[in-house]
């Protein structure tokens, strides 16, 4: 499947998952905490202030690094999965902290967490990597 299609699908699924999570957690627009979001790379569930959210490396890095083997499980398609099963010390895990000022930036940044061989596809069709 073309990367554009993968990510349109991922984004749509993300928005659905966020909506379900908001209902489960009793979140609304005026709730304190951090709203769920699609950051154009992966999906982040809503979180309370002080909560750290962990995610597995997104699909994008399976395109960038087709030979990469991930040690962590992929978060389920129907919900956000059990992020307690993920550990920041694992390769392939990215976190964001929910603070009073909103979400922190990813830690580590995606390339550091998910691995990236910048020379592997140097001559490849760069348009293939556009998301939209």
């Amino acid at each position: 499947m073309h990367s554009d299609c993968i990510f349109k699908k991922e984004q749509a699924m993300c928005l659905e998952k966020i909506q379900r999570a908001n209902e489960l957690m009793g979140f609304n627009d005026s709730s304190p905490g951090c709203p769920g979001m699609w950051d154009n790379i992966t999906c982040w569930k809503p979180a309370h202030v002080g909560e750290m959210v962990l995610v597995s490396c997104p699909e994008l890095f399976r395109i960038f690094n087709p030979d990469q083997v991930w040690e962590t499980e992929t978060i389920g398609e129907s919900d956000f999965g059990d992020s307690n099963s993920l550990d920041l010390s694992d390769m392939g895990v990215v976190s964001r902290n929910c603070t009073e000022d909103g979400w922190s930036e990813p830690f580590p940044h995606y390339f550091d967490a998910c691995g990236f061989d910048e020379y592997e596809s140097e001559t490849g069709d760069q348009d293939y990597y556009y998301l939209s």
Epitope: N40, N97, S104, P106, H109, Y110, Q126, Y130
Partner: antibody, heavy 120, light 107 residues
Framework: QVQLVESGGGVVQPGRSLRLSCAAS????????MHWVRQAPGKGLEWVAV????????YYAESVKGRFTISRDNSKNTLYLQMNSLRAEDTALFYC?????????????WGQGTLVTVSS | EIVLTQSPATLSLSPGERATLSCRAS??????LHWYQQKPGQAPRLLIK???QSLSGIPARFSGSGSGTDFTLTISSLEPEDFAVYYC?????????FGPGTKVDIK
């Protein structure tokens, strides 16, 4: 090897506009976030803006928000900074830098900079 | 925004001495703190990423430590080429910020 070459700097009057360019080579430009960082003469570094690998995410320092626009053309391996309503305090050496990430990242390779002087 | 404070502003030392540079954040940045070296007339160079991770091509005498709000860059034994300005940078929260720098000069 990674190469970043800035251009477009010069002397401009307050209130006018200027567009900086940064030509990238030696890496797959379309996969990396890119930053602009500036340095006023004799002063420290000031982060200005960042753009994600596909241009979908753009973030700015408060001091330039609403006046500067970061953009990129991945088909030309070029990063841009459109600067409007320039002020004397914008006088600085402007560096473009590669962000080691798809989204934002930290600058890992830097160009040599292009000097912008805002003066009447 | 997160304000980074570096101390001292200037550090006067002799070659062979140990240099200890400090960077303090106004709020926690976790480990998303990076160190750069800048020599006169040159672009900055990344020295340490994520507070303590070394980079290939950077001499082993450069090391970093810390997390949260307090960070340290240590140069174990100063070489003549190490006299420069050192900046810390946080990529934990937007807008990203740099510290004001510490100048390491020859005593």
């Amino acid at each position: 090897q990674v190469q970043l070459v800035e251009s477009g700097g010069g002397v401009v009057q307050p209130g006018r506009s200027l567009r900086l360019s940064c030509a990238a080579s030696g890496f797959t430009f379309s996969r990396f976030a890119m930053h602009w960082v500036r340095q006023a003469p004799g002063k420290g570094l000031e982060w200005v803006a960042v753009i994600s690998f596909d241009g979908g995410n753009k973030y700015y320092a408060e001091s330039v928000k609403g006046r500067f626009t970061i953009s990129r053309d991945n088909s030309k391996n070029t990063l841009y900074l459109q600067m409007n309503s320039l002020r004397a305090e914008d006088t600085a050496l402007f560096y473009c830098a590669r962000g080691y990430d798809v989204l934002t990242g930290y600058p890992d390779y830097w160009g040599q900079g292009t000097l912008v002087t805002v003066s009447s | 925004e997160i304000v980074l404070t570096q101390s001292p502003a200037t550090l006067s030392l002799s070659p062979g001495e140990r240099a200890t540079l400090s960077c303090r954040a106004s709020q926690s940045v976790g480990r998303s703190l990076h160190w750069y070296q800048q020599k006169p007339g040159q672009a900055p160079r990344l020295l340490i990423k994520y507070a303590s991770q070394s980079l290939s091509g950077i001499p082993a005498r450069f090391s970093g430590s810390g997390s949260g709000t307090d960070f340290t860059l240590t140069i174990s034994s100063l070489e003549p080429e190490d006299f420069a300005v050192y900046y810390c940078h946080q990529s934990s929260r937007l807008p990203f910020t740099f510290g004001p720098g510490t100048k390491v000069d020859i005593k």
